[in-house]
Interface confidence: low
Protein backbone atom coordinates (compact mmCIF):
# COMPACT_ATOMS: atom_id res chain seq x y z
CA UNK A 1 0.00 0.00 0.00
CA UNK A 2 1.09 3.57 -0.61
CA UNK A 3 1.49 5.97 2.30
CA UNK A 4 2.11 9.68 1.82
CA UNK A 5 2.87 12.48 4.27
CA UNK A 6 2.39 16.05 3.03
CA UNK A 7 3.37 19.39 4.49
CA UNK A 8 1.07 22.37 5.02
CA UNK A 9 1.09 23.44 1.39
CA UNK A 10 0.26 19.97 0.09
CA UNK A 11 3.74 18.92 -1.01
CA UNK A 12 4.67 15.32 -0.23
CA UNK A 13 7.73 14.95 2.00
CA UNK A 14 7.51 11.19 2.65
CA UNK A 15 6.29 8.50 0.29
CA UNK A 16 6.33 4.84 1.16
CA UNK A 17 4.98 1.86 -0.71
CA UNK A 18 5.33 -1.52 0.98
CA UNK A 19 3.55 -4.49 2.45
CA UNK A 20 4.35 -5.55 6.00
CA UNK A 21 4.01 -8.71 8.04
CA UNK A 22 3.99 -8.69 11.83
CA UNK A 23 4.91 -11.49 14.18
CA UNK A 24 3.97 -10.76 17.80
CA UNK A 25 4.60 -12.86 20.88
CA UNK A 26 2.27 -12.21 23.78
CA UNK A 27 1.04 -13.95 26.92
CA UNK A 28 -2.29 -15.69 27.31
CA UNK A 29 -3.66 -17.29 30.46
CA UNK A 30 -2.65 -20.66 29.00
CA UNK A 31 0.89 -19.61 28.12
CA UNK A 32 2.81 -17.68 25.47
CA UNK A 33 1.27 -17.34 22.01
CA UNK A 34 2.50 -16.03 18.68
CA UNK A 35 0.30 -14.23 16.20
CA UNK A 36 1.32 -13.34 12.67
CA UNK A 37 -0.69 -10.93 10.59
CA UNK A 38 -0.23 -8.61 7.64
CA UNK A 39 -0.62 -4.87 7.48
CA UNK A 40 -4.25 -4.65 6.37
CA UNK A 41 -5.28 -2.94 3.16
CA UNK A 42 -7.27 -0.34 5.12
CA UNK A 43 -4.23 0.87 7.10
CA UNK A 44 -4.13 4.67 7.05
CA UNK A 45 -1.59 7.43 7.55
CA UNK A 46 -2.32 9.22 10.85
CA UNK A 47 -2.19 12.74 9.54
CA UNK A 48 -2.09 14.54 12.89
CA UNK A 49 0.79 12.38 14.14
CA UNK A 50 2.83 12.13 10.94
CA UNK A 51 5.02 15.08 10.16
CA UNK A 52 7.37 16.54 7.61
CA UNK A 53 9.52 17.79 10.46
CA UNK A 54 10.81 21.27 11.07
CA UNK A 55 14.12 22.60 9.89
CA UNK A 56 16.79 21.74 12.51
CA UNK A 57 14.24 20.99 15.24
CA UNK A 58 12.37 17.79 14.37
CA UNK A 59 12.62 14.99 11.86
CA UNK A 60 9.98 13.64 9.49
CA UNK A 61 7.85 10.74 10.65
CA UNK A 62 5.32 8.45 9.02
CA UNK A 63 2.67 7.03 11.36
CA UNK A 64 0.41 4.28 10.02
CA UNK A 65 -2.62 3.12 12.00
CA UNK A 66 -4.69 -0.03 11.67
CA UNK A 67 -7.01 -2.26 13.67
CA UNK A 68 -7.90 -1.16 17.18
CA UNK A 69 -4.98 1.01 18.18
CA UNK A 70 -2.03 -0.49 16.28
CA UNK A 71 0.43 2.05 14.89
CA UNK A 72 3.62 1.53 12.91
CA UNK A 73 5.92 4.56 12.97
CA UNK A 74 8.96 5.27 10.80
CA UNK A 75 11.10 8.12 12.11
CA UNK A 76 13.52 9.52 9.54
CA UNK A 77 16.74 11.39 9.99
CA UNK A 78 19.38 12.71 7.60
CA UNK A 79 22.84 14.10 7.27
CA UNK A 80 24.31 16.00 4.34
CA UNK A 81 24.35 13.02 2.01
CA UNK A 82 22.08 10.25 3.32
CA UNK A 83 18.78 9.71 5.04
CA UNK A 84 17.57 6.72 7.02
CA UNK A 85 14.74 5.28 9.04
CA UNK A 86 16.50 5.99 12.30
CA UNK A 87 13.83 4.32 14.38
CA UNK A 88 10.90 2.05 13.69
CA UNK A 89 8.34 1.69 16.45
CA UNK A 90 5.24 -0.42 16.74
CA UNK A 91 2.43 0.25 19.20
CA UNK A 92 0.02 -2.62 19.63
CA UNK A 93 -3.12 -2.91 21.65
CA UNK A 94 -3.50 -6.27 23.38
CA UNK A 95 -7.18 -5.54 23.95
CA UNK A 96 -7.66 -5.95 20.20
CA UNK A 97 -9.20 -9.39 20.48
CA UNK A 98 -9.20 -9.82 16.70
CA UNK A 99 -5.41 -9.79 16.58
CA UNK A 100 -4.54 -10.98 20.08
CA UNK A 101 -7.15 -13.49 21.22
CA UNK A 102 -7.09 -14.43 24.91
CA UNK A 103 -4.32 -11.97 25.79
CA UNK A 104 -3.82 -12.09 29.54
CA UNK A 105 -3.18 -8.35 29.76
CA UNK A 106 -5.13 -5.73 27.86
CA UNK A 107 -2.48 -3.03 27.79
CA UNK A 108 -0.96 -1.06 24.96
CA UNK A 109 2.66 -2.03 24.29
CA UNK A 110 5.34 -0.07 22.47
CA UNK A 111 8.44 -1.62 20.92
CA UNK A 112 11.08 0.06 18.81
CA UNK A 113 14.34 -0.61 17.01
CA UNK A 114 16.91 1.04 14.83
CA UNK A 115 16.82 -0.15 11.20
CA UNK A 116 19.08 -0.72 8.19
CA UNK A 117 16.79 1.29 5.93
CA UNK A 118 18.94 4.02 4.44
CA UNK A 119 19.49 5.68 1.08
CA UNK A 120 21.24 8.59 -0.56
CA UNK A 121 19.46 11.94 -0.46
CA UNK A 122 17.31 12.39 -3.57
CA UNK A 123 17.22 8.65 -4.19
CA UNK A 124 14.48 6.27 -3.20
CA UNK A 125 15.19 3.26 -1.00
CA UNK A 126 14.20 0.07 -2.78
CA UNK A 127 14.08 -3.42 -1.32
CA UNK A 128 12.22 -6.26 -2.98
CA UNK A 129 13.53 -8.83 -0.50
CA UNK A 130 12.05 -9.01 2.98
CA UNK A 131 13.56 -6.44 5.35
CA UNK A 132 13.24 -7.64 8.93
CA UNK A 133 13.22 -5.35 11.94
CA UNK A 134 13.43 -7.20 15.25
CA UNK A 135 11.96 -5.55 18.32
CA UNK A 136 11.17 -6.97 21.73
CA UNK A 137 8.53 -9.71 21.15
CA UNK A 138 7.78 -8.32 17.68
CA UNK A 139 9.29 -8.84 14.24
CA UNK A 140 8.19 -6.58 11.40
CA UNK A 141 9.01 -7.70 7.87
CA UNK A 142 8.68 -5.17 5.04
CA UNK A 143 8.25 -6.66 1.57
CA UNK A 144 8.68 -5.00 -1.81
CA UNK A 145 9.45 -1.66 -0.21
CA UNK A 146 9.96 1.67 -1.93
CA UNK A 147 10.51 4.46 0.57
CA UNK A 148 11.71 8.02 0.24
CA UNK A 149 11.83 10.91 2.67
CA UNK A 150 12.99 14.51 2.19
CA UNK A 151 11.31 14.52 -1.21
CA UNK A 152 11.93 17.48 -3.44
CA UNK A 153 9.05 17.18 -5.92
CA UNK A 154 6.21 15.05 -4.47
CA UNK A 155 7.21 11.91 -6.35
CA UNK A 156 9.70 9.09 -6.03
CA UNK A 157 13.12 9.82 -7.54
CA UNK A 158 14.16 7.83 -10.61
CA UNK A 159 17.43 6.85 -8.98
CA UNK A 160 17.44 4.36 -6.15
CA UNK A 161 19.57 2.90 -3.38
CA UNK A 162 19.03 -0.86 -3.24
CA UNK A 163 19.08 -2.76 0.02
CA UNK A 164 21.90 -5.18 0.77
CA UNK A 165 19.66 -8.23 0.42
CA UNK A 166 18.71 -7.31 -3.17
CA UNK A 167 22.28 -7.03 -4.36
CA UNK A 168 23.62 -10.27 -5.81
CA UNK A 169 26.69 -11.38 -3.91
CA UNK A 170 29.70 -12.62 -5.94
CA UNK A 171 28.93 -16.22 -4.97
CA UNK A 172 25.20 -16.35 -5.71
CA UNK A 173 23.61 -17.06 -9.04
CA UNK A 174 20.88 -14.76 -10.35
CA UNK A 175 17.43 -15.65 -9.07
CA UNK A 176 16.02 -18.77 -10.71
CA UNK A 177 12.75 -18.56 -12.62
CA UNK A 178 9.65 -19.90 -10.87
CA UNK A 179 10.09 -23.66 -10.66
CA UNK A 180 7.50 -26.37 -11.16
CA UNK A 181 6.62 -28.43 -8.13
CA UNK A 182 8.42 -29.99 -6.39
CA UNK A 183 11.06 -27.29 -5.89
CA UNK A 184 14.74 -28.08 -6.43
CA UNK A 185 16.42 -29.40 -3.30
CA UNK A 186 18.41 -26.66 -1.56
CA UNK A 187 21.77 -27.44 -0.02
CA UNK A 188 21.87 -28.68 3.57
CA UNK A 189 21.08 -26.00 6.14
CA UNK A 190 23.83 -24.45 8.26
CA UNK A 191 24.24 -25.97 11.69
CA UNK A 192 23.93 -23.54 14.58
CA UNK A 193 24.07 -23.74 18.37
CA UNK A 194 21.11 -22.71 20.49
CA UNK A 195 20.78 -22.50 24.23
CA UNK A 196 17.96 -21.57 26.55
CA UNK A 197 18.55 -20.48 30.12
CA UNK A 198 16.30 -19.73 33.04
CA UNK A 199 16.69 -18.74 36.68
CA UNK A 200 18.24 -22.12 37.47
CA UNK A 201 20.76 -22.04 34.62
CA UNK A 202 20.75 -23.66 31.18
CA UNK A 203 17.82 -25.96 30.42
CA UNK A 204 18.43 -26.55 26.72
CA UNK A 205 21.53 -27.00 24.60
CA UNK A 206 21.07 -27.73 20.93
CA UNK A 207 23.24 -27.86 17.85
CA UNK A 208 21.44 -28.58 14.58
CA UNK A 209 20.62 -27.50 11.05
CA UNK A 210 16.94 -26.97 10.30
CA UNK A 211 15.03 -27.32 7.06
CA UNK A 212 11.29 -26.83 6.66
CA UNK A 213 9.41 -29.09 4.27
CA UNK A 214 6.14 -27.37 3.32
CA UNK A 215 3.38 -28.52 1.00
CA UNK A 216 0.75 -25.96 0.04
CA UNK A 217 -1.57 -24.81 -2.69
CA UNK A 218 -0.50 -21.85 -4.77
CA UNK A 219 -2.73 -19.09 -6.06
CA UNK A 220 -2.82 -20.82 -9.46
CA UNK A 221 -4.29 -23.96 -7.76
CA UNK A 222 -1.12 -26.03 -8.24
CA UNK A 223 0.31 -27.85 -5.21
CA UNK A 224 3.95 -27.24 -4.48
CA UNK A 225 6.43 -28.68 -1.98
CA UNK A 226 9.12 -26.28 -0.84
CA UNK A 227 12.22 -26.86 1.23
CA UNK A 228 13.25 -23.81 3.23
CA UNK A 229 16.46 -23.66 5.21
CA UNK A 230 16.55 -21.77 8.49
CA UNK A 231 19.44 -19.33 8.15
CA UNK A 232 21.12 -18.97 11.56
CA UNK A 233 22.48 -15.54 10.62
CA UNK A 234 18.94 -14.28 10.17
CA UNK A 235 17.38 -16.04 13.14
CA UNK A 236 16.73 -14.86 16.67
CA UNK A 237 16.48 -17.58 19.29
CA UNK A 238 14.69 -17.35 22.60
CA UNK A 239 12.86 -19.75 24.86
CA UNK A 240 11.76 -20.68 28.33
CA UNK A 241 12.58 -23.19 31.04
CA UNK A 242 9.88 -24.99 32.95
CA UNK A 243 9.72 -27.99 35.23
CA UNK A 244 7.81 -30.01 32.63
CA UNK A 245 8.26 -28.04 29.42
CA UNK A 246 11.29 -26.46 27.77
CA UNK A 247 10.70 -24.30 24.69
CA UNK A 248 13.00 -23.04 21.98
CA UNK A 249 11.55 -20.30 19.80
CA UNK A 250 13.23 -19.32 16.53
CA UNK A 251 12.25 -16.13 14.74
CA UNK A 252 13.56 -16.22 11.22
CA UNK A 253 13.15 -14.30 7.97
CA UNK A 254 9.81 -13.97 6.24
CA UNK A 255 8.05 -13.60 9.61
CA UNK A 256 8.78 -17.27 10.30
CA UNK A 257 8.37 -18.47 13.88
CA UNK A 258 9.39 -22.03 14.63
CA UNK A 259 8.71 -23.34 18.13
CA UNK A 260 10.15 -26.53 19.62
CA UNK A 261 8.70 -27.90 22.86
CA UNK A 262 10.59 -30.52 24.83
CA UNK A 263 8.72 -32.58 27.39
CA UNK A 264 9.87 -34.97 30.08
CA UNK A 265 8.50 -38.31 31.23
CA UNK A 266 9.00 -38.12 34.99
CA UNK A 267 8.63 -41.85 35.57
CA UNK A 268 11.25 -42.86 33.00
CA UNK A 269 13.36 -39.67 33.40
CA UNK A 270 13.56 -39.19 29.65
CA UNK A 271 13.23 -36.00 27.66
CA UNK A 272 11.86 -35.83 24.12
CA UNK A 273 10.76 -33.42 21.43
CA UNK A 274 7.07 -33.17 22.23
CA UNK A 275 5.83 -30.38 20.00
CA UNK A 276 6.63 -28.29 16.95
CA UNK A 277 4.70 -25.23 15.89
CA UNK A 278 5.28 -23.17 12.76
CA UNK A 279 3.92 -19.81 11.67
CA UNK A 280 5.24 -18.44 8.42
CA UNK A 281 4.21 -16.42 5.38
CA UNK A 282 4.22 -17.91 1.89
CA UNK A 283 3.65 -15.03 -0.53
CA UNK A 284 2.70 -17.29 -3.46
CA UNK A 285 0.26 -19.44 -1.49
CA UNK A 286 -3.49 -19.23 -1.83
CA UNK A 287 -3.54 -18.68 1.93
CA UNK A 288 -0.23 -16.89 2.62
CA UNK A 289 -0.41 -17.42 6.41
CA UNK A 290 0.89 -20.96 6.87
CA UNK A 291 0.35 -22.47 10.32
CA UNK A 292 1.06 -26.00 11.53
CA UNK A 293 1.40 -27.59 14.94
CA UNK A 294 1.65 -30.96 16.63
CA UNK A 295 2.11 -31.34 20.38
CA UNK A 296 2.13 -35.12 20.61
CA UNK A 297 5.47 -35.96 19.03
CA UNK A 298 7.97 -38.41 20.52
CA UNK A 299 11.26 -37.53 18.80
CA UNK A 300 14.89 -36.90 19.85
CA UNK A 301 14.59 -38.94 23.05
CA UNK A 302 17.30 -39.42 25.67
CA UNK A 303 17.66 -39.83 29.42
CA UNK A 304 17.58 -36.57 31.37
CA UNK A 305 21.20 -35.57 32.03
CA UNK A 306 22.36 -37.19 28.78
CA UNK A 307 22.34 -35.75 25.29
CA UNK A 308 20.77 -37.03 22.10
CA UNK A 309 22.98 -37.01 19.00
CA UNK A 310 22.26 -37.93 15.40
CA UNK A 311 24.52 -37.23 12.42
CA UNK A 312 22.02 -38.68 9.99
CA UNK A 313 19.24 -36.42 8.73
CA UNK A 314 16.08 -36.86 10.81
CA UNK A 315 12.61 -36.19 9.44
CA UNK A 316 10.02 -35.14 11.99
CA UNK A 317 6.50 -35.20 10.52
CA UNK A 318 4.41 -32.48 12.12
CA UNK A 319 1.30 -32.49 9.91
CA UNK A 320 0.38 -33.81 6.49
CA UNK A 321 1.63 -30.55 4.99
CA UNK A 322 4.68 -29.87 7.14
CA UNK A 323 7.72 -31.70 8.38
CA UNK A 324 11.07 -30.59 9.76
CA UNK A 325 14.31 -32.05 8.48
CA UNK A 326 16.90 -31.87 11.25
CA UNK A 327 20.57 -32.18 10.31
CA UNK A 328 23.44 -33.16 12.63
CA UNK A 329 21.32 -32.77 15.74
CA UNK A 330 22.85 -32.79 19.21
CA UNK A 331 20.40 -31.80 21.92
CA UNK A 332 19.97 -31.94 25.67
CA UNK A 333 16.96 -30.67 27.60
CA UNK A 334 16.00 -29.96 31.23
CA UNK A 335 19.23 -30.91 33.01
CA UNK A 336 22.43 -29.42 31.57
CA UNK A 337 25.46 -29.53 33.86
CA UNK A 338 28.06 -26.78 33.47
CA UNK A 339 26.64 -25.64 30.16
CA UNK A 340 28.08 -28.76 28.44
CA UNK A 341 26.51 -31.71 26.65
CA UNK A 342 26.35 -34.83 28.85
CA UNK A 343 26.87 -38.46 27.86
CA UNK A 344 25.78 -39.10 24.31
CA UNK A 345 22.91 -41.39 23.33
CA UNK A 346 23.30 -42.04 19.60
CA UNK A 347 20.29 -42.32 17.34
CA UNK A 348 19.47 -45.69 15.78
CA UNK A 349 20.19 -44.33 12.32
CA UNK A 350 23.81 -43.59 13.32
CA UNK A 351 24.25 -46.92 15.08
CA UNK A 352 23.05 -48.74 11.97
CA UNK A 353 25.56 -46.83 9.85
CA UNK A 354 28.55 -47.67 12.05
Amino acid sequence: AMFIVKNGNGTACIMANFSAAFSVNYDTKSGPKNMTFDLPSDAKVVLNSSSCGKENTSDPSLVIAFGRGQTLTLNFTRNATRYSVQLMSFVYNLSDTHLFPNASSKEIKTVESITDIRADIDKKYRCVSGTQVHMNNVTVTLHDATIQAYLSNSSFSREETRCEQDRPSPTTAPPAPPSPSPSPVPESPSVDKYNVSGTNGTCLLASMGLQLNLTYERKDNTTVTRLLNINPNKTLASGSCGAHLVTLELHSEGSTVLLFQFGMNASSSRFFLQGIQLNTTLPDARDPAFKAANSSLRALQATVGNSYKCNAEEHVRVTKAFSVNIFKVWVQAFKVEGGQFGSVEECLLDENNM
Epitope: T97, K106, E107
Partner: antibody, heavy 118, light 106 residues
Protein backbone atom coordinates in the same frame (compact mmCIF):
# COMPACT_ATOMS: atom_id res chain seq x y z
CA UNK B 1 -4.80 -0.08 42.08
CA UNK B 2 -6.63 1.66 39.26
CA UNK B 3 -8.73 4.61 40.43
CA UNK B 4 -10.75 7.26 38.62
CA UNK B 5 -11.68 10.20 40.83
CA UNK B 6 -14.36 12.43 39.35
CA UNK B 7 -15.10 16.03 40.32
CA UNK B 8 -18.10 16.93 42.47
CA UNK B 9 -21.73 17.64 41.61
CA UNK B 10 -22.57 20.73 39.55
CA UNK B 11 -25.69 22.90 39.57
CA UNK B 12 -25.75 25.07 36.44
CA UNK B 13 -28.10 27.38 34.59
CA UNK B 14 -29.53 26.65 31.14
CA UNK B 15 -27.31 27.94 28.33
CA UNK B 16 -24.18 27.77 30.47
CA UNK B 17 -21.25 25.34 30.15
CA UNK B 18 -19.76 22.94 32.67
CA UNK B 19 -16.36 21.29 32.77
CA UNK B 20 -15.89 18.14 34.85
CA UNK B 21 -12.72 16.23 35.55
CA UNK B 22 -11.61 12.62 35.96
CA UNK B 23 -8.25 12.10 37.66
CA UNK B 24 -6.62 8.74 36.96
CA UNK B 25 -4.14 6.87 39.14
CA UNK B 26 -2.68 3.40 39.49
CA UNK B 27 -1.75 2.86 35.82
CA UNK B 28 0.07 4.49 32.89
CA UNK B 29 -2.32 7.26 31.93
CA UNK B 30 -1.30 7.48 28.27
CA UNK B 31 -1.88 3.77 27.62
CA UNK B 32 -5.66 3.65 27.97
CA UNK B 33 -8.66 5.36 26.49
CA UNK B 34 -10.99 7.22 28.83
CA UNK B 35 -14.62 6.86 27.80
CA UNK B 36 -17.45 9.06 29.02
CA UNK B 37 -20.95 7.68 29.59
CA UNK B 38 -24.16 9.58 30.42
CA UNK B 39 -26.82 8.06 32.67
CA UNK B 40 -30.19 9.79 32.77
CA UNK B 41 -33.69 8.71 33.78
CA UNK B 42 -35.10 9.56 30.37
CA UNK B 43 -32.43 8.13 28.08
CA UNK B 44 -30.69 5.44 30.11
CA UNK B 45 -26.98 4.83 29.40
CA UNK B 46 -25.45 6.67 26.47
CA UNK B 47 -21.87 6.60 25.21
CA UNK B 48 -20.59 10.13 24.67
CA UNK B 49 -17.08 9.59 23.38
CA UNK B 50 -13.57 8.60 24.33
CA UNK B 51 -10.14 10.16 24.39
CA UNK B 52 -6.77 8.49 23.99
CA UNK B 53 -4.50 10.63 26.19
CA UNK B 54 -1.41 9.40 24.36
CA UNK B 55 -2.17 11.64 21.39
CA UNK B 56 -5.41 13.46 22.22
CA UNK B 57 -7.38 11.55 19.60
CA UNK B 58 -11.07 11.75 20.58
CA UNK B 59 -13.87 10.01 18.68
CA UNK B 60 -17.40 11.09 19.65
CA UNK B 61 -20.87 9.63 19.32
CA UNK B 62 -22.74 11.44 16.56
CA UNK B 63 -25.31 12.65 19.11
CA UNK B 64 -22.76 14.35 21.37
CA UNK B 65 -20.17 15.71 18.96
CA UNK B 66 -21.53 19.26 19.19
CA UNK B 67 -22.29 18.99 22.90
CA UNK B 68 -19.16 17.50 24.49
CA UNK B 69 -15.47 18.32 24.23
CA UNK B 70 -12.94 15.86 25.65
CA UNK B 71 -9.41 16.88 26.60
CA UNK B 72 -6.58 15.30 28.55
CA UNK B 73 -3.72 16.73 30.59
CA UNK B 74 -0.86 14.25 30.68
CA UNK B 75 1.03 16.13 33.38
CA UNK B 76 -1.78 15.65 35.93
CA UNK B 77 -3.20 12.38 34.49
CA UNK B 78 -6.57 14.09 34.26
CA UNK B 79 -9.23 13.92 31.57
CA UNK B 80 -11.83 16.67 31.19
CA UNK B 81 -15.25 16.80 29.60
CA UNK B 82 -16.85 20.14 28.82
CA UNK B 83 -20.57 20.26 28.05
CA UNK B 84 -21.81 23.41 26.34
CA UNK B 85 -25.19 25.13 25.82
CA UNK B 86 -26.76 23.15 28.64
CA UNK B 87 -30.47 22.36 28.77
CA UNK B 88 -32.57 20.32 31.19
CA UNK B 89 -31.97 17.32 28.90
CA UNK B 90 -28.32 17.38 29.99
CA UNK B 91 -29.21 16.79 33.65
CA UNK B 92 -27.65 13.40 34.36
CA UNK B 93 -24.86 11.50 36.04
CA UNK B 94 -21.71 11.41 33.90
CA UNK B 95 -19.19 8.60 34.31
CA UNK B 96 -15.63 8.36 33.11
CA UNK B 97 -14.49 4.82 32.28
CA UNK B 98 -10.98 3.54 31.73
CA UNK B 99 -10.94 0.97 28.94
CA UNK B 100 -9.56 0.30 25.55
CA UNK B 101 -12.38 -0.73 23.26
CA UNK B 102 -12.71 -3.96 25.22
CA UNK B 103 -15.10 -3.65 28.19
CA UNK B 104 -14.11 -6.62 30.34
CA UNK B 105 -11.27 -4.73 31.97
CA UNK B 106 -13.09 -1.44 32.35
CA UNK B 107 -12.88 0.69 35.51
CA UNK B 108 -15.65 3.20 36.22
CA UNK B 109 -15.40 6.47 38.11
CA UNK B 110 -17.96 7.26 40.82
CA UNK B 111 -19.88 9.65 38.55
CA UNK B 112 -20.52 13.41 38.49
CA UNK B 113 -24.10 14.62 38.88
CA UNK B 114 -24.96 17.61 36.69
CA UNK B 115 -28.25 19.41 37.40
CA UNK B 116 -29.41 22.06 34.93
CA UNK B 117 -31.98 24.37 36.45
CA UNK B 118 -32.98 28.00 36.19
CA UNK C 1 -22.37 5.05 14.49
CA UNK C 2 -23.66 1.52 15.03
CA UNK C 3 -27.27 1.55 16.29
CA UNK C 4 -28.50 -0.94 18.90
CA UNK C 5 -32.20 -1.81 19.10
CA UNK C 6 -33.05 -3.39 22.44
CA UNK C 7 -36.38 -5.02 23.24
CA UNK C 8 -38.61 -5.12 25.13
CA UNK C 9 -38.34 -1.70 26.84
CA UNK C 10 -39.85 -3.21 29.97
CA UNK C 11 -40.99 -6.57 31.21
CA UNK C 12 -42.52 -8.15 34.26
CA UNK C 13 -41.83 -11.69 35.45
CA UNK C 14 -42.34 -13.92 38.45
CA UNK C 15 -39.72 -14.88 41.01
CA UNK C 16 -38.09 -18.12 39.97
CA UNK C 17 -39.05 -17.51 36.36
CA UNK C 18 -36.96 -16.74 33.28
CA UNK C 19 -36.69 -13.63 31.12
CA UNK C 20 -34.95 -12.97 27.80
CA UNK C 21 -33.90 -9.62 26.36
CA UNK C 22 -32.75 -9.16 22.77
CA UNK C 23 -30.52 -6.63 21.03
CA UNK C 24 -30.14 -6.13 17.30
CA UNK C 25 -27.17 -4.22 15.88
CA UNK C 26 -27.36 -2.19 12.69
CA UNK C 27 -24.37 -4.18 11.38
CA UNK C 28 -22.34 -7.29 12.23
CA UNK C 29 -20.54 -6.65 15.54
CA UNK C 30 -18.50 -9.87 15.54
CA UNK C 31 -19.70 -10.97 19.04
CA UNK C 32 -18.34 -7.82 20.70
CA UNK C 33 -21.43 -7.56 22.89
CA UNK C 34 -21.69 -6.86 26.61
CA UNK C 35 -24.61 -6.70 29.04
CA UNK C 36 -24.82 -4.30 32.00
CA UNK C 37 -27.10 -4.17 35.02
CA UNK C 38 -28.00 -0.71 36.28
CA UNK C 39 -29.74 0.14 39.55
CA UNK C 40 -30.74 3.61 40.81
CA UNK C 41 -28.03 5.30 42.86
CA UNK C 42 -25.37 2.81 41.74
CA UNK C 43 -22.88 2.60 38.89
CA UNK C 44 -23.55 0.19 36.02
CA UNK C 45 -22.32 -3.36 36.66
CA UNK C 46 -20.84 -5.48 33.86
CA UNK C 47 -22.42 -8.93 33.76
CA UNK C 48 -21.32 -10.43 30.44
CA UNK C 49 -18.75 -9.54 27.79
CA UNK C 50 -17.77 -11.10 24.44
CA UNK C 51 -21.42 -12.14 24.01
CA UNK C 52 -21.40 -15.03 26.49
CA UNK C 53 -18.48 -14.73 28.94
CA UNK C 54 -19.62 -14.11 32.52
CA UNK C 55 -17.64 -11.60 34.54
CA UNK C 56 -16.07 -13.06 37.71
CA UNK C 57 -18.58 -13.18 40.56
CA UNK C 58 -21.66 -13.10 38.34
CA UNK C 59 -24.01 -16.05 38.99
CA UNK C 60 -24.58 -18.57 36.21
CA UNK C 61 -28.30 -17.66 36.20
CA UNK C 62 -27.20 -14.93 33.79
CA UNK C 63 -26.33 -15.98 30.24
CA UNK C 64 -25.81 -14.48 26.82
CA UNK C 65 -25.66 -15.71 23.25
CA UNK C 66 -25.74 -14.51 19.67
CA UNK C 67 -23.64 -13.69 16.63
CA UNK C 68 -23.62 -11.34 13.67
CA UNK C 69 -26.28 -8.71 14.35
CA UNK C 70 -28.57 -10.61 16.77
CA UNK C 71 -27.90 -11.12 20.47
CA UNK C 72 -29.87 -12.21 23.50
CA UNK C 73 -29.49 -12.13 27.26
CA UNK C 74 -31.35 -14.32 29.74
CA UNK C 75 -31.87 -14.49 33.48
CA UNK C 76 -33.25 -17.73 34.85
CA UNK C 77 -34.50 -18.47 38.36
CA UNK C 78 -35.29 -14.77 38.93
CA UNK C 79 -34.48 -13.32 42.35
CA UNK C 80 -35.64 -10.05 43.97
CA UNK C 81 -32.22 -8.45 43.60
CA UNK C 82 -32.48 -8.82 39.81
CA UNK C 83 -34.90 -5.87 39.68
CA UNK C 84 -32.93 -3.36 37.60
CA UNK C 85 -32.56 -1.92 34.13
CA UNK C 86 -30.43 -3.99 31.73
CA UNK C 87 -28.46 -2.58 28.82
CA UNK C 88 -26.66 -4.16 25.91
CA UNK C 89 -23.45 -2.54 24.69
CA UNK C 90 -21.63 -3.14 21.41
CA UNK C 91 -17.92 -2.41 21.42
CA UNK C 92 -16.91 -3.64 18.00
CA UNK C 93 -16.73 -0.11 16.66
CA UNK C 94 -16.50 2.49 19.42
CA UNK C 95 -19.34 1.90 21.91
CA UNK C 96 -23.13 2.02 21.61
CA UNK C 97 -25.62 1.15 24.35
CA UNK C 98 -29.06 -0.25 23.68
CA UNK C 99 -32.10 1.64 24.95
CA UNK C 100 -32.43 -0.46 28.10
CA UNK C 101 -34.98 -2.94 29.47
CA UNK C 102 -36.60 -2.27 32.83
CA UNK C 103 -37.23 -5.53 34.68
CA UNK C 104 -39.96 -5.71 37.31
CA UNK C 105 -41.12 -8.62 39.41
CA UNK C 106 -44.84 -9.52 39.35
Amino acid sequence: QVQLQQSGAELVKPGASVKMSCKASGYIFTNYNIHWVKKSPGQGLEWIGAIYPGNGDAPYSQKFKDKATLTADKSSSTTYMQLSRLTSEDSAVYYCVRANWDVAFAYWGQGTLVSVSA
Amino acid sequence: DIQMTQSPPSLSASLGGKVTITCKASQDIDRYMAWYQDKPGKGPRLLIHDTSTLQPGIPSRFSGSGSGRDYSFSISNLEPEDIATYYCLQYDNLWTFGGGTKLEIK
